[in-house]
Interface confidence: low
Amino acid sequence: GLECDGRTNLCCRQQFFIDFRLIGWNDWIIAPTGYYGNYCEGSCPAYLAGVPGSASSFHTAVVNQYRMRGLNPGTVNSCCIPTKLSTMSMLYFDDEYNIVKRDVPNMIVEECGCA
Amino acid sequence: GLECDGRTNLCCRQQFFIDFRLIGWNDWIIAPTGYYGNYCEGSCPAYLAGVPGSASSFHTAVVNQYRMRGLNPGTVNSCCIPTKLSTMSMLYFDDEYNIVKRDVPNMIVEECGCA
């Protein structure tokens, strides 16, 4: 997946620091105080659909074939979304105010692609 | 997930028949000749992000919190994409022209959501 470097408007991964204080989650998340969660942005022209490939690979390939022939079904758009996410360790209060340490999945966007 | 019924512009599942002849895949796919693969379309306002929930749930929730506070990181958009796909059985020629019957995953869009 591409890294956003200011030189492309294609689907890419933008580094982004998520500050838990800014969204009021510091009252239950103990650590970390924030982290690079990143996000996906950019355009998805037809030739990029399904690259690097989301979970919906066969379906994406079919819709892509329609697109390439100018046969777009309705207003379906190709979307720049996370295609690879990773886990991060977090220390937080659960509903009963116990301190819990857990590896939380899908916290960090590692790669982006067109779905 | 919502079904597109012409009364909403929110993220929904649009029924769509995929005709393999139309995209030139009838030369290798024996059966079926086509199928309802469907697709996702519609808008994803902030309050819908992560509903019914894509795989990136924690990350989606965080970005949604930013959105709801008017703190959109850059130009990140919420996207109407398949959140549940299903398998379908297909009969086709493989690379060596053997006839193969296989359950192909991710062929049919069952539900859509905002990621």
């Epitope: 620091f17 500050d19 650590a31 970390p32 | -």
Partner: antibody, heavy 116, light 107 residues
Framework: QVQLQESGPGLVKPSQTLSLTCTVS??????????VNWIRQPPGKGLEWIGY???????DYNPSLKSRVTMSVDTSKNQFSLKVNSVTAADTAVYYC????????WGKGTTVTVSS | EIVMTQSPATLSLSPGERATLSCRAS??????LAWYQQKPGQAPRLLIY???NRATGIPARFSGSGSGTDFTLTISSLEPEDFAVYYC?????????FGGGTKVEIK
């Protein structure tokens, strides 16, 4: 490309207030949510984290300095400010601002000497 | 506050040798640890973040390992430009704290 630059007077008298500015270029503070850390380094010594501020003005200060430190932000000027009052010779240091998160982008630093 | 202790204070090695620097936290910081290199008159430069990830543009001879309380920065084969002071930083909890530094000098 994100760049940070510290500026301020090089010499401050004891008991006065040290005022520094960190000017950010490469992303607008009004739309980005990237904060900065202030870090200092006394001559010949190690690094000390002073605190953090984000574009909304939320701050976290090092408890050892909290009573004397104030941080602020002016998004229209793309600037963060640091003030340390009642300075002594122990506040003589190179002062850095660095991008939030694990600090990956640093300014070059500005030297502040506290002396009469 | 979390106290970060680096050892040794000074490491005397020759170019081409392997350098192993240690950083210990007074309590667990998970993998929220970074390593910096600093040369005289310059700002620190990020080498490693999240304990093991090399920052952009950092040569492969630099590697980080560890989690919890014990961390290591390894320079597989010292180049002349690697002689500098190295700091670790924990960023799991405020206040963020740096180690006291390890000076890698030419033997």
């Amino acid at each position: 490309q994100v760049q940070l630059q510290e500026s301020g007077p090089g010499l401050v008298k004891p008991s006065q207030t040290l005022s520094l500015t960190c000017t950010v270029s490469g992303f607008p503070l009004s739309t980005s949510r990237m904060g900065v850390n202030w870090i200092r380094q006394p001559p010949g010594k190690g690094l000390e984290w002073i605190g953090y501020i984000n574009p909304s003005g939320a701050t976290d200060y090092n408890p050892s300095l909290k009573s004397r430190v104030t941080m602020s932000v002016d998004t229209s000027k793309n600037q963060f400010s640091l003030k340390v009052n009642s300075v002594t010779a122990a506040d003589t240091a190179v002062y850095y601002c660095a991008r939030a998160g694990y600090p990956d982008v640093w300014g070059k630093g500005t030297t502040v000497t506290v002396s009469s | 506050e979390i106290v970060m202790t680096q050892s040794p204070a000074t490491l005397s090695l020759s170019p081409g040798e392997r350098a192993t620097l240690s950083c210990r936290a007074s309590q667990s910081v998970s993998t929220h640890l970074a390593w910096y290199q600093q040369k005289p008159g310059q700002a620190p430069r990020l080498l490693i973040y999240d304990a093991t990830n090399r920052a952009t543009g950092i040569p492969a001879r630099f590697s980080g390992s560890g989690s919890g309380t014990d961390f290591t920065l390894t320079i597989s084969s010292l180049e002349p430009e690697d002689f500098a002071v190295y700091y670790c930083l924990q960023y799991t909890n405020y206040p963020w704290t740096f180690g006291g530094g390890t000076k890698v000098e030419i033997k």
